[in-house]
Amino acid sequence: MAVTACQGLGFVVSLIGIAGIIAATCMDQWSTQDLYNNPVTAVFNYQGLWRSCVRESSGFTECRGYFTLLGLPAMLQAVRALMIVGIVLGAIGLLVSIFALKCIRIGSMEDSAKANMTLTSGIMFIVSGLCAIAGVSVFANMLVTNFWMSTANMYTGMGGMVQTVQTRYTFGAALFVGWVAGGLTLIGGVMMCIACRGLAPEETNYKAVSYHASGHSVAYKPGGFKASTGFGSNTKNKKIYDGGARTEDEVQSYPSKHDYV
């Protein structure tokens, strides 16, 4: 039940996160005109990944797309790429996770397949979230750099007679939406990965496989754990990473294809 809840919650959180990443990518307010310490203008500038806009005091807003591809800064192209990769991975992850949901029955799909799909979607969500966070952070870094550069030469004058105020840009709403959305997608992915462990059938967990020799039995535990002899009370060693209370001997009586690595 807890596994289903974790998986379901992971899916919902990731869904919200990806919706947020899509929204952030489409938003025009990645950078907005800095109003602090500036003359009061009757024009407000803001820019997105795809177009720049000007809102006039009259109430009119004019937006212009970036119709060039080669003329755009490499950083902007990189941010676009990161956000698109994030969206694509997230969308595929959502598609995979829908079929992986424990509450959805598709034919005679085995729990092991569902576990694998859950893990796959979880990894996809994590990468998607990281892409979004990276994209937004790169853009934010670009803004900070440009902000201080334009502050350094805030006023560029012609012979000291005429002052031209440079428009400085600061963080827009889309950056915060992107950070939060990326974080949610990342959290959702982690939850899916956690759910995967609980989803896997009992046999898929790391089990100690006992190889019975002629004189005595030795249980070899994978993963570098100390091998224990099969004499006396040691033959009742509890297996590692198992939610149940079965012993090695009990496992041996239910062989499956997963027992032999």
Epitope: P39, V40, A42, V54, E56, S58, G59, T164
Partner: antibody
């Protein structure tokens, strides 16, 4: 057809008050920023105050700040200018204007005259 | 506040002549976001309210005759009337539409001989 009609002008004593109104028609009033512009006799144009379509942004000329209040009633398509502590230098023809593309004032009313005199 | 300086203060020309008047602003009116200059020209005929002629420094308002041309960028702007007509007798004002408070130039009075 866009129309702006000002009213409320007249003779006022120094220190007195007056409320000017501007009734708009022929356009979606709440979508446009509006201004009051004045012109003293035989003088040039002087912008007085601005109010955005949703009344969330307001700006005033420094010399009228604290004395004049611009407001609007969008359902009634009306713009107001409440003037208090009037001075002789406030004597002018007051025009109501609509702000359009490029922040240009594309429509002007015929104006209402305010005379501040004892 | 932005200071708008218009010159000359008055002009007397004969009908059919070409006339140019200038307007200087104390700060650039060019908006980097859309590369537009927020400067407007108005015409005020005697006893009438002003009329919009040109916005964005060079965009003619609909219904304005094409003999009126606006040009310039940054801090220096001009209004040119290619062939003055008797109907053009008026005072012409330039206005800063970029910074609050909006400021007008003192005007150029155009008189016909």
């Amino acid at each position: 057809d866009v129309q702006l009609v000002e009213s409320g002008g007249g003779l006022v004593q120094p220190g007195g008050s007056r409320k000017l109104s501007c009734t708009a028609s022929g356009f979606t009033f709440n979508s446009f920023g509006m201004n009051w512009v004045r012109q003293a006799p035989e003088k040039g144009l002087e912008w007085v105050a601005f109010i955005s379509g949703g009344s969330n942004t307001i700006h005033y000329l420094d010399t009228v700040k604290g004395r004049f209040t611009i407001s609007r009633d969008n359902p009634k398509n009306t713009l107001f200018l409440q003037m208090t502590s009037l001075r002789s230098e406030d004597t002018a023809m007051y025009y109501c204007t609509r702000l359009a593309l490029g922040n240009a004032m594309d429509y002007w009313g015929q104006g209402t005259s305010v005379i501040v005199s004892s | 506040d932005i200071v708008m300086t218009q010159s000359p203060s008055s002009l007397t020309v004969t009908a059919g002549e070409k006339v140019t008047m200038s307007c200087k602003s104390s700060q650039s009116l060019l908006n980097s976001g859309n590369q537009k200059n927020y400067l407007t020209w108005y015409q005020q005929k005697p006893g009438q309210p002003p009329k919009l002629l040109i916005y964005w420094a060079s965009t003619r308002e609909s219904g304005v005759p094409d003999r009126f041309t606006g040009s310039g960028s940054g801090t220096y702007f001009t209004l040119t009337i290619s062939s003055v007509q008797a109907a053009d007798l008026a005072v012409y004002y330039c206005q800063n539409d970029y910074y609050f408070p909006f400021t007008f130039g003192s005007g150029t009075k155009l008189e016909i001989k």
